[in-house]
Interface confidence: medium
């Protein structure tokens, strides 16, 4: 299953399959997730080790048993790959690292006014993988405001150095934010020239293209089909690059197929997995396990559930079958691709779905009336769980926010439905940033069921929570995916990085905003909050957030939206925007429904709604 917990001051001993430099544990975990054999990782921050060569070291590890002995090492951070973690699987990494220089091949330098502009340049450059930016206070005047675009053979820095007034980060191409655009065309009977960066075996050109998309240095590819004249080159997928970023030449060639990486696509990237099953094909590789199952789909499920399994062959040979079950061969290789592909067999083959980010039809959890005032514009995909609840009758209007917590579930505030409890007047827009982008052709979800907390009463602030079941499940993308819920009764975690988002008013007597706003707000203790609201009862089922001096808060139109906090690199839904005295007033914090206190209720309702378990626990 999915394991998300991080182990502080711990280092996994042995099992090394690769090592690299990464700026933090979260990026190290992402590299582990996408490495075909990595199950565990250990990361050494700069503060944890004196050896300069091992600072920022990210060590990717494998283990036949799925675990390794942990040794104590102060400052080290260890954890698990996020394979099998559904929507949490993403190659997108937005963080900017201050005081850090990520080294690589500097291939472009320009003057820019901000680190955000530098990151944008990197994202819009086909070869850029990461960048460094020298701020205006950098010690050497001639380097100030320099934006260095970089790449490396492995896509990660060749070294990372602590350096004042330098900020570094990664290209946002894996976030589907590139302005370059992509070539979706597949070119039959055409071979591309240039530099081969890797060679793998694939059953078709589409798998080849997906592998190219997620390979750090692949810009285009050529695939040799299973009828290619040279037998030893059949099913070979050549991943390629060039100085210019495009093929310098192409040659008409029978039984070859060429195409481009889709990493530069805007708004949508292919999933990093291959779901197709190939009948009459055997995939060769190292044997992991053999099991008897009924049908090729069950064989694929078995492979997906066994975390080390990369691909499988389901044999229909009479000697491999007994009654209705046949042998399911679970296999792996060094690079995640078959070592041999044979056609015209009695088998069916395919890949593990462990890296598919659609996950199952569930809500995400972890084991362990009110625009934002004083906020700033959000960017695409920054808050992919945020939805807009709109009412359409004589006019269509944004009324509330909400949070996507599963393919078919949205969590919001009960008071959003005061006087409007009818599902057919509501439209739910997800995966949007700008309300003015909504046109008559913009897809929306309709409500199947509104579940208001049984103890909620109109005009009272208690139990202000409601679940929405959508009529049809949503697919997950970089711009539309769920937020994880906290553990039941989560009281021990101290959240220091919390944000409220919404399209609500920017001042008490304002209007709905077009661009989704965000504001960083500190949590306030319930005792402190109670002092500020002496006429109301602040219960343990509420959480408060705000600045003593005011100025930043949720406001009308943000109701039902998320208060999210980042902890151990993971966002969790801590609160639901509920109520407050005015907006952003001095010593009047915003009051939010505390989600952790309603976990039993959420579980009960999402499970009982259609009789099957809807909850998924990645930890």
């Amino acid at each position: 299953g999915c394991l998300t917990q991080l182990y502080e001051n711990a280092f996994f001993r042995g099992g090394d399959v690769a090592s690299m430099y990464t700026p933090n544990a979260q990026y190290c975990q992402m590299r582990c997730t996408f490495h075909p054999r990595c199950l565990l990782f250990s990361f050494l921050p700069a503060s944890s080790i004196n050896d300069m060569e091992k600072r920022f070291g990210c060590f990717l590890k494998d283990s036949v048993t799925g675990t390794l002995p942990k040794v104590h090492r102060t400052g080290a951070v260890s954890g698990h790959s996020l394979k099998q973690c559904g929507h949490q699987i993403s190659a997108c990494h937005r963080d900017i690292y201050k005081g850090v220089d990520m080294r690589g091949v500097n291939f472009n330098v320009s003057k820019v006014s901000s680190v955000e502009e530098c990151q944008k340049r990197c994202t819009s450059n086909i070869r850029c993988q990461f960048f460094s930016y020298a701020t205006q206070t950098f010690h050497k005047a001639e380097y100030r405001n320099n934006c260095l675009l970089k790449y490396s053979p492995g896509g990660t820095p060749t070294a990372i150095k602590v350096l004042s007034n330098v900020e570094s980060g990664f290209s946002l191409k894996p976030c589907a934010l590139s302005e370059i655009g992509c070539h979706m065309n597949i070119f039959q009977h055409l071979a591309f020239s240039d530099v081969d960066v890797a060679r793998v075996l694939t059953p078709d050109a589409f798998v080849c293209r997906t592998i190219c998309t997620y390979h750090p240095n692949c810009l285009f590819f050529t695939f040799y089909t299973n009828v290619w004249k040279i037998e030893s080159q059949r099913n070979v997928c050549l991943l390629k690059t060039s100085e210019s970023g495009t093929p310098s030449s192409s040659t008409p060639q029978e039984n070859t197929i060429s195409g481009y990486s889709l990493l530069t696509c805007k708004r949508t990237l292919p999933e990093p997995c291959h779901s197709k099953i190939y009948p009459g094909v055997d995939f060769g590789g190292e044997e992991l396990n053999v099991t008897f199952v009924k049908g090729v789909n069950v064989c694929q499920e078995t492979c997906t559930k066994m975390i080390r399994c990369q691909f499988f062959t389901y044999s229909l040979l009479p000697e491999d079958c007994k009654e209705e079950k046949c042998k399911c061969f679970l296999r792996l290789s060094m690079d995640g691709s078959p070592t041999r592909i044979a056609y015209g067999t009695q088998g069916s083959s395919g890949y593990s779905l462990r890296l598919c980010n659609t996950g199952d039809n569930s809500v995400c959890t972890t084991k362990t009336s009110t625009r934002i005032v004083g906020g700033t514009n959000s960017s695409w995909g920054e808050w992919p769980w945020q939805v807009s609840l709109q009412v359409k009758l004589t006019a269509q209007r944004h009324l509330c926010g909400g949070s996507l917590i599963g393919h078919q579930w949205v969590l919001t505030a009960a008071h959003c439905f005061d006087g409007l409890p009818l599902q057919d007047v509501w439209r739910i827009y997800s995966g949007i940033l700008n309300l003015s982008d909504i046109t008559k052709d913009t897809p929306f979800s309709q409500i199947k069921e509104i579940i208001i907390h049984q103890n909620y009463k109109v005009s009272e602030g208690n139990h202000d929570i409601a679940l929405i079941k959508l009529q049809a499940p949503l697919n997950y993308t970089e711009f539309q995916k769920p937020i994880c819920l906290p553990s039941k009764g989560d009281t021990s975690t101290i959240y220091t990085n919390c944000w409220v988002t919404g399209w609500g008013f920017s001042k008490e007597k304002g209007e709905i905003q077009n661009i989704l706003q965000k504001v960083n707000i500190p949590l306030v203790t319930n005792e402190e909050c109670q002092k500020r609201y002496q006429d109301y009862k602040i219960t343990q089922r509420m959480v408060c957030a705000g600045y003593k001096e005011g100025g930043k808060d949720a406001c009308k139109g943000d109701s039902g939206g998320p208060l999210v906090c980042k902890h151990n690199g993971m966002w969790r839904l801590v609160g639901i925007t509920s109520w407050g005295e005015g907006c952003a007033r001095r010593e009047q914090p915003g009051v939010y429904t505390k989600v952790a206190e309603y976990m039993d209720w959420i579980l009960e309702k999402t499970q009982s709604s259609d009789g099957k378990a809807q909850m998924q626990s990645p930890a």
């Epitope: 009758l393 004589t394 006019a395 209007r397 057919d424 007047v425 003015s436 046109t439």
Partner: antibody
Amino acid sequence: EVQLLESGGGLVQPGGSLRLSCAASGFTFSVYLMHWVRQAPGKGLEWVSGISPSGGYTQYADSVKGRFTISRDNSKNTLYLQMNSLRAEDTAVYYCARPGGLDAFDIWGQGTMVTVSS
Amino acid sequence: DIQMTQSPSSLSASVGDRVTITCRASQSINTYLNWYQQKPGKAPKVLIHAASTLESGVPSRFSGSGSGTDFTLTISSLQPEDFATYYCQQSYSTPPTFGQGTKVEIK
């Protein structure tokens, strides 16, 4: 072809009642909001009433509140407007209209004339 | 209720002329504004929704602009079939309200 066809208009005395119908065809009636809009002779357009797809939620212009009732029968693909306590100022062509993906009324019927006069 | 004021209430123009009709809302309505064309004895027909989005099938000589309280409908080159009455309508809040209309006549 997407069509709306009104019927039920006519001459009625002040204080009298009339029931307008609007037959819909060519689209899935049950998923659309529906509205009545009227136009007095030589005057502009005035929204009268709207109803949600299931019929559970209705809204009215202040000028007709308490006198007019909008309803629908999704099994018959028909929208209704029950008009009671009619006044001379209710004299108008009554259109049923369907809003499109957002708010504009993109489909209109041909209209039915209601005359309130003694 | 939001009041919608159109100007002029009528205008005379020739075929080929550029015609501009303005519509002002009594409060900000963002871009929730639609334009309709109505010919005598006929039902209105939507031309533009969301202030500037041309309805499919409507000739490109029609265009809309504006945001907040001030909006414009422009006919770049008036054609014989364009002589009609034009209405703006806000869909920002209930009740939806229409302008009083602008009649475009042949000079």
